[in-house]
Interface confidence: medium
Amino acid sequence: DPVLCFTQYEESSGKCKGLLGGGVSVEDCCLNTAFAYQKRSGGLCQPCRSPRWSLWSTWAPCSVTCSEGSQLRYRRCVGWNGQCSGKVAPGTLEWQLQACEDQQCCPEMGGWSGWGPWEPCSVTCSKGTRTRRRACNHPAPKCGGHCPGQAQESEACDTQQVCPTHGAWATWGPWTPCSASCHGGPHEPKETRSRKCSAPEPSQKPPGKPCPGLAYEQRRCTGLPPCPVAGGWGPWGPVSPCPVTCGLGQTMEQRTCNHPVPQHGGPFCAGDATRTHICNTAVPCPVDGEWDSWGEWSPCIRRNMKSISCQEIPGQQSRGRTCRGRKFDGHRCAGQQQDIRHCYSIQHCPLKGSWSEWSTWGLCMPPCGPNPTRARQRLCTPLLPKYPPTVSMVEGQGEKNVTFWGRPLPRCEELQGQKLVVEEKRPCLHVPACKDPEEEEL
């Protein structure tokens, strides 16, 4: 199916930028892996690069405004021609759910005191309003609560006094015709208009104010301008060459508003002075290599020694990584393919251990299933031997850091019947539903 093709993908917002055009296939659009596409206008934007997870969204608001609730966030698998980690297809949403508490207590209503006395009338003549007030303190509300109803009430009042009426101008009358149809004669042509103080007239008893300003005004007449001439387009110019050497590009034609040129305030030509076309080089763009994550460290060994485990003998270990994805003469990966370090082996070493403090509460699992729970743990943590943190392996090469490597066998006193891990679980409360945010916008 044809798609809308864009030249940029904005990682921070997940939006397509720089529309190249529509009516092209995903395969042609994604000849350039820097490009992105939409299946329909306003739909989900997918980048042409290999799929990976987007950043997590911000946490949604807590599902309740007071006491303990839950909140969701999500991330989306974005990209083309592959899968994200976990064998997940592009477009899939992954969710996380955690407990939240915006406010520990919930609001409690208060009660009103009695009404205070009436204030004076709001006007000194004719009819107005007067107001009285009461306080929300009988009892006072708690935890951001309020009292039901209004803190003040008003009623009509009559001063038994007649108000004066002040004068106001009616609208201006029409301009009188000019005394001549052109400028430059023996008399400067003028036009005049007038207005009346009748909207309303000022009262006599009690006396109102007269209208401010003048009852008439004059101005000079201006001559008629020459007739305007509307602009017209000239022919389209030649098509510009395709500006790219790979993937899709955009060529352009131009025309000028000079057939004729607009004159005396006539309108400019309607429509566009340029038009664009998609050009297809049918050549895939280079794709630079990207390092995979480092592999596991190899076992910690020392040459010519069968085992150095559980001994204060430094060894060496290495790890590697692979340069993936380089295609069509893209750049090779920069940096080293192998990493070497010095190490002490504590693989399967019986070590004294101590219980850790409780971990923080984990995420609610499953985030989109029923009855999610969260957990925290205490772990039996090994106490590492006090071996020297640096060693000098070769004369004149200086001190090198030494890292502990391997899985020891920590020994802790039994805690709640457990020797290695103690876990506590708790249900998550007021759980909201997982809904695709793209669908909610529609």
Epitope: T92, W95, P366, P367, C368, G369, P370, A433, C434
Partner: nanobody, 129 residues
Framework: QVQLVESGGGLVQAGDSLRFSCAAS????????MGWFRQAPGKEREFVAA????????YYADSIAGRFTISRDNAKNRVYLQMNSLKPEDTADYSC??????????????????????WGQGTQVTVSS
């Protein structure tokens, strides 16, 4: 053991309606997302519709949008497919499927048959013109 049993298939005229039912047993039905797929003779299996465990979200293939409706009853351990304005091209073997991941959502997840854990045997629908 786990069982998904479809019912409600048969021979109908073009323009008629039909309602499928899929009865589930042997697993916690209310924790699973459910989907319907179909396979016409000589063609690949095709996604029809899906519904999340809670019933809050539903997803449909473009070819059936507006004509078919998926729903579920967690009390009865059943998922339904209401099919209106049937066409000869709707002729196929219809199967229901169950997914218990509870972790992902979105059309691009539920329209892939390999994400589902359990499948029914299927029921045949023939639409004559």
């Amino acid at each position: 053991q786990v069982q998904l049993v479809e019912s409600g298939g048969g021979l109908v005229q073009a323009g008629d309606s039909l309602r499928f039912s899929c009865a589930a047993s042997g697993f916690t039905f209310s924790s699973y997302a459910m989907g319907w797929f179909r396979q016409a003779p000589g063609k690949e299996r095709e996604f029809v519709a899906a519904i999340t465990w809670s019933g809050v979200s539903t997803y449909y293939a473009d070819s059936i949008a507006g004509r078919f409706t998926i729903s579920r009853d967690n009390a009865k351990n059943r998922v339904y497919l209401q099919m209106n304005s049937l066409k000869p091209e709707d002729t196929a073997d219809y199967s229901c499927a169950a997914d218990g991941s509870g972790r992902y959502s979105g059309m691009e997840y539920y329209n892939r048959d390999w994400v589902y854990d359990y499948w029914g045997q299927g029921t045949q629908v023939t639409v004559s013109s």
